[in-house]
Interface confidence: low
């Protein structure tokens, strides 16, 4: 029964880690910003700017940070708990059905239509039929 509770059993915030980058898993899972070690004994911090994890997990590796493509601007950098947020440059937008690339917004509406919405990083200009 003395085996019930050891240093290994303490909640992550209760342990004095040998290095700041390690803590023990809780319920077999590691917190956001960490991945689990191969032997399941430690939670290892993701590398800032290189990889990340957003949820409690038992990943053996953190997820690789996204690099913004040319034609995109970096809205916020990759942290250990959040992926890079990229946004299409001004004058371009990302369509829901082809999210892998930014497309140029149209410069104007077809004849007989009027513009009711501007070009945004997530939508083309919006055109509606002119009322006759």
């Amino acid at each position: 029964e003395s085996a019930l509770i050891t240093q290994q059993d303490l909640a992550p915030q209760q342990r004095v880690a040998p290095q700041q980058k390690r803590s023990s898993p809780s319920e077999g899972l590691c917190p956001p910003g960490h991945h689990i070690s191969e032997d399941g004994r430690d939670c290892i911090s993701c590398k800032y700017g290189q990889d990340y994890s957003t949820h409690w997990n038992d990943l053996l590796f953190c997820l690789r940070c996204t690099r913004c493509d040319s034609g995109e601007v970096e809205l916020s950098p990759c942290t250990t708990t959040r992926n890079t947020v990229c946004q299409c440059e001004e004058g371009t937008f990302r369509e829901e059905d082809s999210p892998e690339m930014c497309r140029k917004c149209r410069t104007g509406c077809p004849r007989g239509m009027v513009k009711v919405g501007d070009c945004t990083p997530w939508s083309d200009i919006e055109c509606v039929h002119k009322e006759s």
Partner: antibody, heavy 121, light 118 residues
Framework: EVQLVESGGGLVKPGGSLRLSCAAS????????MHWVRQAPGKGLEWVAG????????YYADSVKGRFTISRDNAKNSLYLQMNSLRAEDTAVYYC??????????????WGQGTLVTVSS | QPVLHQPPAMSSALGTTIRLTCTLR?????????VYWYQQRPGHPPRFLLR?????????GPQVPPRFSGSKDVARNRGYLSISELQPEDEAMYYC???????????FGSGTQLTVLS
């Protein structure tokens, strides 16, 4: 539906050996930690051994250390318990149980029906 | 003295609420541990009921109704299992397990036999 079915129990003489098996189905066996827990007649639950998802890490109760070996074959969706140098006090129903995580916790979410091991001369 | 102590038997009437206790030996602090509860009906394998660490960190077992709930009293170093609207099928042995939010060795309490009086 998660199912765990133990087999291999029976009557064995003190000092003898027995190998228990647990056939798992209804879930991705290779991603869960697994345990053996036993219950002597009329007594409470006693954790025996645990193994992580890959089989790389094995843990034992002090009462069985050096005599019992836990193992798994992920290709066959099977968990095993090799029991050597059996003693009368090892007489119990042996349950196979799934851990809710890849590793080992106290959260054993699914249990088999158990297999009875009787050690007697 | 065992690490986990449970009273051997408790009873309550049909339709009432009962609270089962699991006391952690006082050289350990329940504040940093989860409390796990298992139910075992006669002739059946154990069944995981719930895990309780805090109001915001808890989990219910598969198909376990909300009549079963967990709590902790840090001052008294105790974990509790509350069962409301007691039913005949709640008559069973209840085991707690504690500590080790990531521990690999596993110790159960000695169990409490619950009798439901009709």
């Amino acid at each position: 539906e998660v199912q765990l079915v133990e087999s291999g129990g029976g009557l064995v003489k003190p000092g003898g050996s027995l190998r228990l098996s647990c056939a798992a189905s209804g879930f991705t066996f290779s991603t869960y930690g697994m345990h053996w827990v036993r219950q002597a007649p009329g007594k409470g639950l006693e954790w025996v051994a645990g193994i992580n998802y890959s089989g790389n890490n094995k843990y034992y109760a002090d009462s069985v250390k050096g005599r019992f070996t836990i193992s798994r074959d992920n290709a066959k969706n099977s968990l095993y318990l090799q029991m050597n140098s059996l003693r009368a006090e090892d007489t119990a129903v042996y349950y196979c149980a799934r851990d809710h995580s890849t590793w080992l916790s106290r959260h054993l979410d699914y249990w088999g029906q158990g297999t009875l091991v009787t050690v007697s001369s | 003295q065992p690490v986990l102590h449970q009273p051997p038997a408790m009873s309550s009437a049909l339709g009432t609420t009962i609270r089962l206790t699991c006391t952690l030996r006082n050289d350990h602090d329940i504040g940093v541990y989860s409390v796990y509860w298992y139910q075992q009906r006669p002739g059946h394998p154990p069944r995981f009921l719930l895990r309780y660490f805090s109001q915001s960190d808890k989990s219910q077992g598969p198909q376990v109704p909300p009549r079963f709930s967990g709590s902790k009293d840090v001052a008294r170093n105790r974990g509790y299992l509350s069962i409301s609207e007691l039913q005949p099928e709640d008559e069973a042995m209840y085991y707690c397990a504690m500590g080790a939010r990531s521990s690999v060795t596993h110790v159960f309490g000695s169990g409490t036999q619950l009798t439901v009086l009709s």
